[in-house]
């Protein structure tokens, strides 16, 4: 594959990333399918600057990130480590609520309305952003 | 790397109490929900008690609801399990472990007997 | 409560066999279920979570499938170091509860 030098139509360049951002909802499941078959994945916080940056054009919309802990530890979906890595919960958050009654606790990070960070459970229909890296390889085969 | 190390397990007569603690490292503690699991003398495993990240939520087995206190101090890394009122049936190797059983601790021996 | 039932209780397996232990929840859990492994006198290792998540570092030779209500984890080819203690676990509502264990024993 090629270097992808330019962001996609509809999507917002940002720091050699590309950013989409969607106006309606899916489940966590869904909304990460969705952008690994934009050859993308949701967003990964890693820095003040990027939150800052997907908080502006999301505006106060419950967001899906790339952020879970389905199967016990909290992992980012491009590898990035969540450890050493740059965290904005909300205070008290994440608390892996059972009150819901949905089953399980709540296993799927998003932006709240104030940008902080929750967990909540993966089934809800959230907004969603897809992210990739400018600089990576792309599938397409480059253009003869 | 992920470290859960319990103490504060012994030798107690029923009634009596004992505070069982586990320090933890290699993580950030106050992301994850902990919890206490027992296992009786040649006996599976038993279920005791969680608390979320920032303790708002605890949760207990019947068989210690009223008689057991789980806290953590996410300052000091460590959660800790307060046992009041033991009985015989208590006596187990008690577990910490993390968020649904990731990781687990080498556990600590709490005998109840007179 | 929860009541999850695991079977065979034990079972005796050579070297190289494949090895399959069921696990059966009393109502629906969906994917809400772990498998440990436990050794005599050792704390329980996590195998598997959302019933067939294999966790970071075990060996693929491991698998866990199901949702609902039946759930199974296999061996593919047991090896010396897999004769132990087997447990499921579910964590879709409080308390959380545990098979009783199925002993993997060597035939």
């Known amino acids: 594959g090629s270097e992808r030098t330019c962001c996609p139509v509809n999507w917002v360049e940002h720091e050699r990333s590309c950013y989409w951002f969607s106006r309606s909802g899916k489940a966590w499941a869904d909304a990460d399918n969705y952008c690994r078959l934009e050859d993308a994945h949701l967003v990964v916080v890693t820095s003040w600057e990027e939150q800052k940056f997907v908080q502006h054009h999301i505006g106060p919309v419950n967001t899906w990130m790339g952020l879970h802990d389905q199967n016990g530890p909290w992992k980012w979906v491009d590898g990035t480590d969540y450890e050493t890595g740059f965290k904005n919960w909300r205070p008290e958050q994440p608390d892996d609520w059972y009150g819901h009654g949905l089953g399980g606790g709540e296993d799927c990070a998003h932006f709240t309305d104030d940008g902080r960070w929750n967990d909540d459970v993966c089934q809800r229909p959230y907004r969603w952003v897809c992210e990739t890296e400018l600089d990576k390889a792309s599938q397409e085969p480059p253009l003869l | 790397e992920v470290q859960l190390v319990e103490s504060g397990g012994g030798l107690v007569k029923p009634g009596g109490s004992l505070r069982l603690s586990c320090a933890a490292s290699g993580f950030t503690f106050s992301s994850y929900s902990m919890n206490w699991v027992r296992q009786a003398p040649g006996k599976g495993l038993e279920w005791v008690s969680s608390?979320?990240?920032?303790?708002?939520?605890?949760y207990y087995a019947d068989s210690v609801k009223g008689r057991f206190t789980i806290s953590r101090d996410n300052a000091k890394n460590s959660l800790y399990l307060q046992m009041n009122s033991l009985r015989t049936e208590d006596t187990a190797v008690y577990y910490c472990a993390r968020d649904r059983g990731s990781y687990w601790g080498q556990g600590t021996q709490v005998t109840v007997s007179s | 409560d929860i009541q999850m039932t695991q079977s065979p209780s034990s079972l005796s397996a050579s070297v190289g066999d494949r090895v399959t232990i069921t696990c059966r929840a009393s109502?629906?859990?969906?994917?809400?279920l772990a498998w440990f492994q436990q050794k005599p006198g050792k704390a329980p290792k996590s195998l598997i979570s959302a019933a067939s998540s294999l966790q970071s570092g075990v060996p693929s030779k491991f698998s866990g499938s199901g949702s609902g209500t039946d759930f199974t984890l296999t061996i593919s080819s047991l090896q010396p170091e897999d004769f132990a203690t087997y447990y499921c676990?579910?964590?879709?509502?409080?308390?959380?509860?545990f098979g009783q264990g199925t002993k993997v024993e060597i035939n």
């Open positions: 676990q579910q964590y879709h509502s409080y308390p959380w509860t």
């Open positions: 109502q629906d859990i969906s994917n809400y």
């Open positions: 608390i979320s990240g920032s303790s708002t939520y605890k």
